[in-house]
């Protein structure tokens, strides 16, 4: 026996264009409260088949009067957890259904109008005892986060609510092979008859005639030691028994992970990559199918007729994951080419290109001169995303539009004047240097370092800068 | 805004080769998936499948054996061809970009009319 | 496959009236993932909703859909002349991705 316990979290609407219109209004307040039903196994059972395994229905909510203009927030919710008592073992697999309801509190002849506001399904695996699994759906625009557990009553213990409690015998411990009753530490498991030969140091069993391992030991009576690569990369003290030294306490120790999980350790706790066909922070779901609909965030579910069958989800741009749960940062990707910036605006990328790309993704490479005419000769020289003219002598400008001023640049060295001239500039060198821009010193014996003076054109003589 | 422009012949022969391609305008298509979606005359909508620019492809089972799909990401294209073609595959053929959100279709093409007729 | 059943097949009715069309599945769809399309003589479907009840960028708020598991309903809150047209029911959460096979909405 034991108690099935739903904590709904947050009900409003979910992700995607499109906000839903808010249940309630200024002429209609309304209030909520939910139904759940719980049937065992992951058997195909319609909406309408009785709730095998209990059903609950919550408090009402507080009333709300939605704002005129606001989009639907989420919706206040009714104070406490639902609970749904089973009487028998607690089945390990289930389905579960929970509606949202909405209770119109207008002025309804014969009292308050129900309608059904969404409806969530699901099937999945969970041991009693363990801890609250979380969990979201969306039903249409809405999306309703919830976490549920099973968890045993007195003196029922064990995954399955199947082991029994009873008093101490004695005050200080419980009988060889038993332990105490978490989280009644005053009592002790009732004996099991596991199986013969089972350790009694490393195994256990919940159900007579089978036994279990604990972690770190295998075999059909629990009485090998596993032997892992965790020897070689010790992180705590040596065990006696192996002589291997067995790691400290970490998120992934005992991989938390079920059904082949791969388990990683995250800042503040562990993350399950789970193969294909299981799902859940533990990927404990199993036996699902496309029915199921275990594709998350629009993801499209392709196979997966039977539980027999693999299922994929293909999943919208910007998720993956083997049920599309987790969002991708697209920019990650560098989608963006040519230096373009990224932005992931949620339903779609943008590239903000750099000047002289275009494209979605920047990819064209514009071509800087088409159009772009060089005026009174030049050429156009494509280059770093914008053109530019190299200008025939005598003119100068973007364009190549403007008449040069040749001396503008002080173009002579050593105080030398610069004066125009119909095919370039001239440099007037001042006494004791020469060449075209008056770069060479003239040595005091006359005669000059390289290069030699042209012939005919004394030292001093304005030279012509061809 | 985003368009959608199918190109293709308006007649092919039985038993040849029917190539369609949509051509789309003001969206990069690695940022969606694409889908072909056809319509016979006077009749309902079939869906023939959908392509990803990773190259993730779903294709009706009904038309799978003679479906390729393919996408040309530095044209913005992507295209449909259908092998052993007969009288039944005369349709309206559109192409489609399925929603960020989940496989509706929010941005259609205007279609085009193929008839197989010897 | 999810087999998408639409009733009725023609649906006559006067501009202002109230229009209820019904997309009924084969098997539960999962987390609502039913669309609604209107498509005219010559023209592409056109989405009006997606997610059973979220209405499409640019569509009327005469346009709303409901419904989950597999009864889904698509309603007009007062007919224009524009709204006669055929409209189909998709569902995308299972492949293949199915259509129903129309509601034809003509003037009376």
């Known amino acids: 026996a034991g108690v099935f316990e739903l904590q709904i979290h947050s009900f409003g609407p979910g992700p995607g264009p499109g906000a839903p219109r808010s249940p309630c209004s200024a002429r209609l307040p309304c209030r909520l409260f939910f139904r759940v039903c719980l049937k065992p196994g992951l058997s195909e059972e319609a909406a309408e088949s009785p709730c095998a395994l209990g059903a609950a229905l919550s408090a009402r909510g507080p009333v709300y009067t939605e704002q005129p203009g606001a989009p639907a927030p989420d919706l206040p919710l009714p104070d406490g957890l639902l609970q749904v008592p089973f009487r028998d073992a607690w089945p390990g697999t289930f389905s579960f259904i929970i509606e949202t309801w909405r209770e119109e509190l207008g002025d309804q002849i014969g009292g308050p109008a129900w309608s059904l506001l969404a409806r969530v399904a699901g099937r999945r695996r969970l041991a009693a005892g363990g801890p609250w699994a979380r969990d979201i759906q969306r039903a249409g625009a809405w999306e309703l986060r919830f976490s549920y557990r099973a968890r045993c009553e007195p003196p029922a213990v064990g995954t399955a609510c199947t082991r029994l409690c009873r008093p101490r015998s004695a005050p200080s411990r419980c009988g060889p092979g038993l332990r105490p009753c978490a989280p009644l530490e005053d009592e002790c498991e009732a004996p099991l008859v596991c199986r013969a030969g089972c350790s009694p140091e490393h195994g256990f069993c919940e159900q007579p005639g089978e036994c279990r391992c604990l972690e770190g030991w295998t075999g059909p009576l629990c009485t090998v030691p596993v032997s892992t690569s965790s020897c070689l990369s010790p992180r705590g003290p040596s065990s006696a028994t192996t002589g291997c030294l067995v790691p400290g306490p970490g998120p992934c120790d005992g991989n938390p992970c079920a059904n082949g999980g791969s388990c990683s350790e995250t800042p503040r706790s562990f993350e399950c990559t789970c193969p294909r066909g299981f799902y859940g922070l533990r990927c404990e779901v199993s036996g699902v199918t496309c029915a199921d609909g275990p594709c998350f965030n629009g993801g499209l579910c392709v196979g997966g007729a039977d539980p027999d069958s693999a299922y994929i989800c293909h999943c919208p741009p910007g998720f993956q994951g083997s049920n599309c749960e987790k969002r991708v940062d697209r920019c990650s990707l560098q989608p963006c080419r040519n230096g373009g910036l990224c932005l992931d605006l949620g339903h779609a990328l943008r590239c903000r290109c750099r000047a002289g790309f275009a494209g979605p993704r920047c990819e064209h490479d514009l071509d800087d001169c088409a159009g772009r005419a060089c005026a009174n000769g030049g050429t156009c020289v494509e280059g770093g995303g914008a053109h530019r003219c190299s200008c025939a002598l005598g003119f100068g400008g973007r364009d190549c539009r403007e008449r040069a001023d040749p001396c503008a640049a002080r173009p002579c060295a050593h105080g030398g004047r610069c004066y125009a001239h119909f095919s370039g500039l001239v440099c007037a060198c001042a006494p004791g240097y020469m060449g075209a821009r008056c770069e060479f010193p003239v040595h005091p014996d006359g005669a000059s370092a390289l290069p030699a003076a042209p012939p005919g054109l004394r030292p001093g003589d304005p030279q012509r800068y061809l | 805004q985003v368009q959608l422009q199918e190109s293709g012949p308006g007649l092919v022969k039985p038993s040849e080769t029917l190539s369609l391609t949509c051509t789309v305008s003001?969206?990069?298509?690695?940022?969606?998936?694409w889908s072909w979606i056809r319509q016979p005359p006077g009749k309902g909508l079939e869906w023939i499948g959908y392509i990803y620019y990773s190259g993730t492809t779903n294709y009706n089972p009904s038309l799978k054996s003679r479906v390729t799909m393919s996408v040309d990401t530095s044209k913005n294209q992507f295209s449909l061809k259908l092998s052993s073609v007969t009288a039944a595959d005369t349709a309206v053929y559109f192409c489609?970009?399925?929603?960020?959100?989940?496989?509706?279709?929010?941005?259609w093409g205007q279609g085009t009319m193929v008839t197989f007729s010897s | 496959e999810i087999v998408l059943t639409q009733s009725p097949g023609t649906l006559s009715l006067s501009p202002g009236e109230r229009a209820t069309l019904s997309c009924r599945a084969s098997?539960?769809?999962?987390?609502?993932?039913l669309a609604w399309y209107q498509q005219k003589p010559g023209q592409a479907p056109r989405l009006l909703i997606y997610?059973?009840?979220s209405r499409a960028t640019g569509i009327p708020d005469r346009f709303s859909g409901s419904g989950s598991g597999t009864e889904f309903t698509l309603t007009i809150s007062r007919l224009e002349p524009e709204d006669f047209a055929v409209y189909y029911c998709?569902?995308?959460?299972?492949?293949?991705?199915?259509f129903g096979q129309g509601t034809r909405l003509e003037i009376k």
């Open positions: 998709q569902q995308y959460g299972w492949s293949p991705i199915t």
């Open positions: 489609a970009r399925l929603s960020n959100w989940g496989f509706a279709f929010d941005i």
């Open positions: 003001n969206v990069s298509i690695s940022s969606y998936y």
């Open positions: 098997q539960t769809i999962s987390s609502s993932y």
């Open positions: 997610g059973a009840s």
